[in-house]
Amino acid sequence: FNISGCSTKKLLWTYSTRSEEEFVLFCDLPEPQKSHFCHRNRLSPKQVPEHLPFMGSNDLSDVQWYQQPSNGDPLEDIRKSYPHIIQDKCTLHFLTPGVNNSGSYICRPKMIKSPYDVACCVKMILEVKPQTNASCEYSASHKQDLLLGSTGSISCPSLSCQSDAQSPAVTWYKNGKLLSVERSNRIVVDEVYDYHQGTYVCDYTQSDTVSSWTVRAVVQVRTIVGDTKLKPDILDPVEDTLEVELGKPLTISCKARFGFERVFNPVIKWYIKDSDLEWEVSVPEAKSIKSTLKDEIIERNIILEKVTQRDLRRKFVCFVQNSIGNTTQSVQLKEKRG
């Protein structure tokens, strides 16, 4: 199709080489009438349609994204050619940063409902650059946490070092929906609830008087509880003795509950005590078996191919640790009688 009639938007993604970050493009088609994608030709000059990413109805999620190759080749369907770019309804998600994401992206409705819709498309010229100036040492992260029940704020990463007086007008989106009231480089949340979690996008316009472009950043916000004040507790094994059959294989499971910590470095390991000797056992990797907002249960097994007489004289110790402290639980094997 002919893209010369598409409305054009210029965007800049300045990514930090130090962190993983994502990026999104919204299919900002004009939305003068809810029932149709757009009928721009029918609008009088005074009827300026509002540009919003569309969300909600099945109709509106039915868009097609293309990339325009720089060498003049035909448009490429995003889904076929770019595995690191995912389409979700009207939004295009870039999972990894990199200058190779620079280019022109075109979106248009899949279903053309009327002759007016032919030119209904948006061309987004995306420029991707690594962050060069280290003038801002403490710029906000693209992953931000809000503490449940308390006051918090979400900062626009590209503007977090900007003083309030010099920061520009910002447009915020949450999960693709425009937050029309928010205009500052920081969203202040009076009381944090779990619904504040989500993907936030902050846009501001930068200009050189000849042209202007949108600078965009994406922030993943999660709601968290306060860091635990407790060391982990071992849920299993509960007993300090375990009846076993000699010559048979045995798996002993250690399950421990770790309270939430923002910087989470759980330790769960098995070691063996034999008279005065003590050594750590190489056992299968630990795995998380249950994760909630407040805590996580992690399991690690020790596997004996067959229980020997020597194993009955040993103590098998599960050791768990977080930043607060550690807990141990030892198990003595006992031969099953009868």
Epitope: N133, S135, C136, S158, L159, C161, Q162, S163, D164, A165, Q166, S167, P168, A169, V170, T171, E182, R183, S184, Y204, T205, Q206, S207, D208, T209, S212
Partner: antibody
Framework: SVEESGGRLVTPGTPLTLTCTAS????????MCWVRQAPGKGLEWIGF?????NTYYATWAKGRFTISRSSATVDLKITSATAEDTATYFC????????????????WGPGTLVTVSS | AQVLTQTPSPVSAAVGGTVTINCQAS????????LAWYQQKPGQPPKLLIY???KLASGVPLRFSGSGSGTQFTLTISGVQCDDAATYYC????????????FGGGTEVVVK
């Protein structure tokens, strides 16, 4: 374009509100500032209002002026006019040139004249 | 309060000549370059000429140029034309919640 209105002849002590309207761009997406110019004198920055409603003033203007905004207008209220407030009042749009540079006034209205006299 | 001092005033120049206007700030502008030059003709609002100390605004003739950083700035008009007769103002932006912006006193350019 930007246009100011509300300028007129008032007596000292009278409050007066000047209004700034825009066409061709969304006023709510920009910071807007007010500047005045007494007859035959230079430009004097009064203050500005950000898109989020936060206001900033020159030291001399604090308490004498209040800037506010709605979705369609930006207002400047002269709390109690004095003879030295006689001036042409300009409303200007602020554009952002980036965080290593800052804001500038790129689009000005023709101005509205306020005369304070008894 | 921030003070911007412009010199000289007035300044007169012949058509085709060069005019240099200086602007000295009492303290460094934001990021050392948040300085603009505006041109104002009688009965008209100011017009942005230069921003970021040296960048030319859209539609401004190349005979206008700006330079400087921190507290000292200069506007130069090379090859002055009759149409350049106007008053020129420098304006600085600051990283401050009061007096965020300030204008210089203005320099009148008379073209002979």
């Amino acid at each position: 374009s930007v246009e100011e209105s509300g300028g007129r002849l008032v007596t000292p002590g009278t409050p007066l509100t000047l209004t700034c309207t825009a066409s061709g761009f969304s006023l709510s997406s920009y910071h807007m500032c007010w500047v005045r110019q007494a007859p035959g004198k230079g430009l004097e920055w009064i203050g500005f209002i950000k898109a989020d409603g936060n206001t900033y003033y020159a030291t001399w203007a604090k308490g004498r002026f209040t800037i506010s905004r709605s979705s369609a207008t930006v207002d400047l209220k002269i709390t109690s006019a004095t003879a030295e407030d006689t001036a042409t009042y300009f409303c200007a749009r602020m554009f952002y040139a980036g965080h290593t540079s800052g804001h500038y006034f790129d689009l000005w209205g023709p101005g509205t004249l306020v005369t304070v006299s008894s | 309060a921030q003070v911007l001092t412009q010199t000289p005033s007035p300044v007169s120049a012949a058509v085709g000549g060069t005019v240099t206007i200086n602007c000295q700030a009492s303290q460094s502008v934001y990021n050392n370059k948040n300085l603009a030059w505006y041109q104002q003709k009688p009965g008209q609002p100011p017009k942005l000429l230069i921003y970021d100390a040296s960048k030319l605004a859209s539609g401004v003739p190349l005979r206008f140029s700006g330079s400087g950083s921190g507290t000292q700035f200069t506007l130069t008009i090379s090859g002055v034309q009759c149409d350049d007769a106007a008053t020129y103002y420098c304006a600085g932006g600051y990283d401050s919640s009061v007096d965020t912006f300030a204008f210089g006193g203005g320099t009148e350019v008379v073209v002979k």
